[in-house]
Interface confidence: low
């Protein structure tokens, strides 16, 4: 399907005469009839097999013909055809004089013909105009012509149908030869297959529209190249989906048991040495000059509270110095110039005279101490809590807050390692002096009975179409990772594709 276009450009009839030689009165009001037909070696009358077209009156005698194509006019003249362009043609152009407004053949005088030209030849489909000029004794006609394809038709003969589309059935435009040219982001014979995000993993990812990357089960990440570990896996990794391979220092089925508290938490301060002493427990060996469970306290000579009777201690490079309160003197403020008459006992302490009143002693109520009952008793100074327990003052008493794995008033008792049921899959737990041991049921092994040795859901090869099978250890089931083009829990169904391209 296409259009033969004829562009009339200039007609010269300087004497204003008809083909018969008779002059037009007052001038030749000229219109044209065009006949397009199949190739004839000698162009002869007969049906215009490719079509006909007539113009209105375009001018008088000699004139240029305006290009009206942009305004919806009739120049170029259009001769559409609905067949494969044969590449050859015959063309007859007649110039007629119209004395009145009726241009029908039967309304014209028999000698109204001004001129007639007939050409024939080859013409390929294309955008370029072929210019021609035909001259007779009295007239000259300048014109150009071409054949172009109708919308959606392409190729050398306008025989190839191609309609651009951007929907489920294809995403393309048409090339000049009618071949498809995929829109950006699409590929395939009919441009139905999206081009996924650059780098999207071929097996583990797919896409339904361009520049996306959708992950198959068990995979994640921008490019679907990161496997998803087993559900609940805390400190582990995987190389295929649903695995849980523990990082160094972690153990258990879900890699959630801390076997290296020292490395993971660095609890010891001030350059102390840390030693792991079981799950979540540790011991800090302090450097000289430091103390505390985590060696967080700096030792000084004043730490032993050498100053008596409320004296304040000041550290010095070569020791310490006691600043004594009024009424006391001596290296440690141990000598008193006070007597009971001066009420030296604080916090409800009772004063007792000594050495005939030259000295005195205070009897302190509970929770207070010191020569003058000036100090509140700190029952935690002796670090009574074992195994890294935290000592808390509670009025007249104290209590220990134990670390996990320990109990008792002073955290001196080890909680049974079996209390947390560490053995998986019904394994039997045995407490040992240095930890625990699991006795596993048939079909399981490993330190915690976490390894399945006989039951394997993938052993029966349940996945079809070369899909990859993964065993889910927590549910004794399998997961099939389907290759491209298959779906279903066992990848047994091919993805439905349109049987042929729908025009």
């Amino acid at each position: 399907s296409g259009v033969f276009q004829l562009q009339l450009q200039e007609f010269i009839n300087e004497r204003g005469v008809l083909a018969s030689g008779r002059p037009c009165e007052p001038g030749c009001r000229t219109f044209f009839r065009v006949c397009l037909k199949h190739f004839q070696a000698v162009v002869s009358p007969g049906p215009c097999t490719f079509g006909t077209v007539s113009t209105p009156v375009l001018g008088t005698n000699s004139f240029a013909v305006r290009d009206d194509s942009s305004g919806g006019g009739r120049n170029p003249l259009q001769l559409p055809f609905n067949f494969t362009w044969p590449g050859t043609f015959s063309l007859i152009i007649e110039a007629w004089h119209a004395p009145g407004d009726d241009l029908r053949p039967e309304a014209l005088p028999p000698d109204a013909l001004i001129s007639k030209i007939a050409i024939q030849g080859s013409l390929a489909v294309g955008q370029n105009w072929l210019l021609d000029e035909q001259t007779s004794t009295l007239t000259r006609l300048r014109y150009s012509y071409r054949v172009i394809c109708s919308d959606n038709y392409y190729g050398d003969n306008c025989s190839r149908l191609c309609k651009k589309r951007n929907d489920h059935f294809g995403h393309y435009v048409c090339q000049p030869d009618g071949n498809l040219s995929c829109l950006p982001g699409w590929t395939g014979e009919y441009c139905q297959q999206p081009i996924c995000l650059s780098g999207c993993h071929e097996q583990n990812g797919y896409c339904s529209k361009p520049a996306e990357c959708l992950c198959r089960p068990g995979w994640q990440g921008r490019l679907c190249n990161e496997c998803i570990p087993h559900n609940g896996c805390r400190h582990g990794t995987c190389s295929t989906p649903w695995q849980c391979t523990c990082d160094e220092g972690w153990g258990g089925l879900f890699c959630d048991q801390d076997l290296n508290y020292c490395t993971h938490h660095s609890p010891c301060k001030n350059g102390a040495t840390c030693s792991n002493s079981g799950q979540r427990s540790y011991t800090c060996t302090c450097r000289p000059g430091y103390t505390g469970v985590d060696c967080e306290l700096e030792l000084s000579e004043c730490d032993s509270n050498p100053c008596r009777n409320g004296g304040s201690c000041k550290d010095q490079e070569d020791g310490y110095h006691c600043l004594c309160p009024p009424g006391y003197y001596g290296l440690h403020c141990e000598h008193s110039t006070l007597s009971c008459a001066d009420s030296p006992c604080f916090n409800g302490g009772s004063c007792r005279e000594r050495n005939q009143g030259a000295n005195y002693a205070c009897e302190c109520p509970p929770n207070f101490t010191g020569s003058n009952c000036e100090k509140k008793v700190d029952r935690c100074t002796s670090n009574p809590c074992a195994n890294g327990g935290q000592c808390l003052n509670r009025g007249p008493s104290r209590m220990c807050r134990c670390r996990p794995g320990f109990t008792g008033t002073y955290c001196e008792l080890h909680v049974s390692d079996c209390a947390r049921n560490p053995c998986a899959h019904g394994g039997t737990c045995h407490d040992l002096e240095n930890g625990l041991m699991c006795t596993c049921p048939a079909g399981f092994s490993g330190r915690r009975c976490e390894v399945r040795t006989s039951i394997d859901a993938c052993a029966s090869s349940p996945c079809f179409n070369r899909a990859t099978c993964y065993t889910d250890l927590s549910t004794d089931t399998f997961v099939c990772n389907c290759p491209y083009g298959f779906v279903g829990s066992r990848c047994e169904f091919p993805v439905g594709l349109p049987p042929s391209f729908p025009w």
């Epitope: 001018g59 008088t60 004139f63 290009d67 942009s70």
Partner: nanobody
Framework: EVQLVESGGGLVQPGGSLRLSCAAS????????MSWVRRPPGKGPEWVSA????????YYADSVKGRFTISRDNAKNTLYLQMNSLKPEDTAVYYC????????????????WGQGTQVTVSS
């Protein structure tokens, strides 16, 4: 929308030169013959020069022959008129237009017109 925009006019002394330009848009310029038309003060329009669509054929009014040169650049959609040895009688508003009817001496009917550019030749 078809547009023809003339430029290059101005005041020039007798014997001087000017080059007029006509920028076309909104239609296939290379398919059209083009012409220059002028309207002297108090007179009707008169044809000056014309050129065919390809630029191979040029036509001039007797009054400007040998002094004016018409040309075109289809790639730039522009028509030109080089005017040398200007005379006071060349004073007019100059228009570019698409001829649609020709007489024995040149175009006499036009399709599209520009708005014109004033040329004044005076000492």
């Amino acid at each position: 929308e078809v547009q023809l925009v003339e430029s290059g006019g101005g005041l020039v002394q007798p014997g001087g030169s000017l080059r007029l330009s006509c920028a076309a848009s909104g239609f296939t310029f290379g398919n059209y013959d083009m012409s220059w038309v002028r309207r002297p003060p108090g007179k009707g329009p008169e044809w000056v020069s014309a050129i065919n669509s390809g630029g191979g054929s040029t036509y001039y009014a007797d009054s400007v022959k040998g002094r004016f040169t018409i040309s075109r650049d289809n790639a730039k959609n522009t028509l030109y008129l080089q005017m040398n040895s200007l005379k006071p009688e060349d004073t007019a508003v100059y228009y570019c237009a698409t001829p649609r009817g020709w007489g024995p001496t040149g175009p006499h009917e036009y399709g599209y017109w520009g708005q014109g550019t004033q040329v004044t030749v005076s000492s």
